[in-house]
């Protein structure tokens, strides 16, 4: 028998520095977690103690903090190289800055193979990107070889900016021939490493003949066997065992997100490459694990540029940006409009001639807007200003909801109106009229939404049975501010870009902004 240790991360999302327990900015260092310096300590400890170790990343290193905003992926290559990752799969967010924003900072600089079997380049890009990412890689480990085959969410064109010269194929269809090739190379230990979410990970384990282990990402799935060490609630045991169609037991793993845990899986193979046993657990990277001094020093060196960036002007406003709770928790506020407009703008994807865009709607809890921006400071808007407006380090995500769920959400928005509570929704691509004289749960008297399957966008009444795409904060997607119906009834959820980054990019693009209050949210006569 031959034993392999798989160390794995996924959805790190730019958390190079240690974070608080909820993966936001570290405040009290003695209680902080994660970060590449701490990760390196643990990885090195395991490498020294065990003979056959692979360190793998399942995608979405890009996007999530000011580190990515400033360094644009160079930080990912630098610190992943320093940690000596063995391989990485491409995630959807690796395409956030377009293909060039992937090629130059990461693909050309990574000292480890970057993989995806279901992304096929065409046209002029094919020769430019050739060899910079691979469908699979055979890695030598001790006296054996291990095949790693990569995959990426086929929804990436709707979630990021891969352009028109990359085709995202069905994962299972694309993986099978590559696994067959590995088998033909007499490689009998095969890991599928990819970024399509836990449901697809399980399907790959079930359907792709020859895959021995699946290491996934995208869905931020936390798996754990025994008593979990922090706040995350396990979605199942670690590893999650799937019985394949040909009768094999295939371990599937994921390691939550944000570098809070290091996935740790031990696999025992027989001489024919069959998995005999698998066990392990994610390792919580808490403050009991010291940060590696040399990596920490490097982080501090790179950090200097971030502090300078946060005070630079992104653009100007010529109007007061009203982000006060007195406005945003009670009525349409222009800060809410600005943020929603930025959210939609960030999700412009012309992937189908029938649609002007794949999504037109935005909702945003008023309580998530934490500060106004005064235009009387020469109109200057900085990252620092935006960090005061959006201090929680969240993301603006894409969900699919039925019209009936949206209606419930808008009823919830005003179910206890007047108490300055955070659930009052700011909107984009939506016209809502409330009648507060009616009883809670029956206050939405008009709800019109902007069409997407149209060449001239216009507002049509919401249809209860129709499925709509909506951009919203991850806080709402996870049921925050009492929006349990969103969490319970959403049909799809894909995590998006860092909230501040979305707004800062929009402001930089527009250069001068002047958002207005324009009648997106109305109250019917006599009730307000």
């Amino acid at each position: 028998a031959w034993e392999l240790t798989i160390l794995h991360t996924n959805d790190v999302h730019s958390r190079l520095e240690q974070t608080s327990e909820d993966s936001s900015k570290c405040v009290n260092a003695s209680r902080c977690m994660g970060g590449v310096a701490r990760l390196f300590t643990k990885v090195q400890q395991i490498r020294r103690a065990e003979p056959n170790v692979l360190l793998l990343d399942a995608g979405d290193q890009y996007q999530g903090t000011i580190w990515f905003t400033v360094y644009k992926g160079a930080e990912v290559a630098h610190f992943m190289n320093a940690l000596r990752y063995d391989a990485m799969a491409l995630g959807n967010h690796e395409f956030d800055n377009g293909v060039e924003g992937l090629i130059e900072p990461l693909l050309k600089e990574a000292k480890f193979p970057i993989l995806s079997a279901n992304i096929k380049a065409k046209g002029p890009l094919a020769s430019q990107i050739s060899g910079l990412y691979l469908p699979y890689k055979v890695l030598p480990v001790g006296d054996e070889v291990v095949g790693i085959v990569g995959y990426t969410s086929k929804e990436t064109p709707f979630l990021s900016n891969p352009g028109t010269n990359l085709v995202f194929e069905d994962e299972i269809t694309a993986l099978q021939p590559e696994v067959d090739k590995l088998k033909t190379l007499n490689v009998n230990k095969i890991i599928a490493l990819g970024h399509s979410g836990f449901e697809m990970d399980k399907l790959i384990a079930q359907k792709v003949r020859g895959v021995d282990v699946v290491v996934g990402g995208h869905s931020n799935t936390f798996l754990y066997t025994g008593n979990p060490p922090s706040k995350e609630v396990p979605a199942g045991k670690y590893p999650f065992i799937v019985t394949s169609d040909d009768g094999r037991k295939v371990p599937v793993v994921q390691a939550y997100a944000f570098g809070k845990y290091l996935g740790y899986l031990k696999i025992e193979f027989d001489e024919r490459g069959n998995v005999i046993s698998s066990h392990g657990n994610p390792i919580l990277l808490n403050s009991s694990i010291p940060e590696d001094p040399s990596i920490k020093a490097d982080i501090n060196k790179w950090r200097i540029k971030l502090d300078n960036y946060s005070t630079q002007e992104l653009g100007k406003t010529i109007v007061y940006l009203d982000g006060s709770s007195q406005s945003c928790r009670f009525r349409e506020c222009n800060m809410g409009n600005l943020i929603c407009d930025a959210m939609i703008n960030n999700n412009l994807r012309h992937t189908d001639e029938m649609f002007w865009n794949h999504v037109s709607m935005c909702i945003l809890n008023g309580g998530g807007i934490r500060s106004p921006i005064d235009e009387r400071n020469n109109g200057t808007i900085t990252w620092e200003n935006l960090a005061a407006v959006l201090p929680f380090g969240g993301t603006f995500d894409l969900v699919q909801l039925k019209g009936s769920t949206l209606k419930k959400a808008f009823e919830h928005s005003v179910h206890r109106y007047g108490q300055s509570t955070g659930e009052f929704l700011q909107v984009g691509g939506i016209h809502v009229v409330y009648d507060l004289s009616r009883k809670p749960g029956d206050r939405v008297v008009k709800l019109d939404v902007l069409c997407t399957k149209c060449r001239v966008p216009s507002y049509d009444p919401l249809k209860m049975d129709e499925v709509y795409k909506v951009i919203l904060p991850n806080f709402l997607a996870n049921g925050g501010d009492g929006f349990q119906m969103i969490k319970d009834e959403l049909l799809r959820h894909d995590s998006g870009d860092q909230d501040i980054n979305v707004v800062s990019t929009y402001i930089s693009k527009m250069k001068v902004i002047y958002p207005a209050v324009e009648g997106r949210i109305k109250f019917s006569t006599g009730s307000h």
Epitope: R84, D86, K108, A110, K111, F112, P113, G131, L134, Y136, K137, V138, L139, P140, V141, G142, V145, K181, T184, L185, N186
Partner: antibody, heavy 118, light 107 residues
Framework: QVQLQQSGPELVKPGASVRISCKTS????????IYWVKQRPGQGLEWIGW????????KYNEKFKGKSTLTADKSSSTAFMQLSSLTSEDSAVYFC???????????WGQGTLVTVSS | DIVMTQSHKFMSTSIGDRVSITCKAS??????VAWYQQKPGQSPKLLIY???TRHTGVPDRFTGSGSGTEHTLTISSVQAEDLALYYC?????????FGSGTTLEIK
């Protein structure tokens, strides 16, 4: 473009050792195997072994264990092969080569002629 | 070790002819076979891998076929620059092994 530049010819005495270098450029050194291949005059090709610079893993053809030692220097993107206890049987042209994606030899150095003679 | 046998040490041909060079493996190597061309004083050059996949820049007159133990390199219309030594190699398992070579010469 991918290039593998080998060190020049060597004339060595029996029993001595020789170290051949293979300096690479035009790609990320750590991401591909470097293979070494022996070709005796008028003879075929023999695979000596590989080194994977990413994790410095080395695999030898059993036939060449003890004869050759493979190393790599990531900082200079250079692979090395040392041949020890040389005999006339070791007189050959030695090639380094890079894989495309494992197991076949897509790019070759120009070869280094080693002559063992007293 | 897997032995790759190229039974023809030499093959004579004429410019414009179609020629097939064969290679037999001592055990099943599936489709894990590569072909190389070597000219005097030069290093080998990869032509084909995975039995039938042409390497970048290789003219389409070169094709590979076969599976299991029997493999063939075919040149559909021999050009003067094709006169060289051709080796097969199995990339199925280590140690990777080569055939002894077939020299293509003019009749």
């Amino acid at each position: 473009q991918v290039q593998l530049q080998q060190s020049g010819p060597e004339l060595v005495k029996p029993g001595a050792s020789v170290r051949i270098s293979c300096k690479t450029s035009g790609y990320t050194f750590t991401n591909y195997y470097i293979y070494w291949v022996k070709q005796r005059p008028g003879q075929g090709l023999e695979w000596i072994g590989w080194i994977y610079p990413g994790n410095l893993n080395i695999k030898y053809n059993e036939k060449f264990k003890g004869k050759s030692t493979l190393t790599a220097d990531k900082s200079s993107s250079t692979a090395f092969m040392q041949l020890s206890s040389l005999t006339s049987e070791d007189s050959a042209v030695y090639f380094c080569a890079r894989d495309d994606n494992y197991a076949w030899f897509a790019y070759w150095g120009q070869g280094t002629l080693v002559t063992v003679s007293s | 070790d897997i032995v790759m046998t190229q039974s023809h040490k030499f093959m004579s041909t004429s410019i414009g002819d179609r020629v097939s060079i064969t290679c037999k493996a001592s055990q099943d190597v599936s489709t894990a076979v590569a072909w190389y061309q070597q000219k005097p004083g030069q290093s080998p050059k990869l032509l084909i891998y995975w039995t039938n996949t042409r390497h970048t820049g290789v003219p389409d007159r070169f094709t590979g076929s076969g599976s299991g133990t029997e493999h063939t390199l075919t040149i559909s219309s021999v050009q003067a620059e094709d006169l060289a030594l051709y080796y097969c190699q199995q990339h199925y398992s280590t140690p990777f092994t080569f055939g002894s070579g077939t020299t293509l010469e003019i009749k």
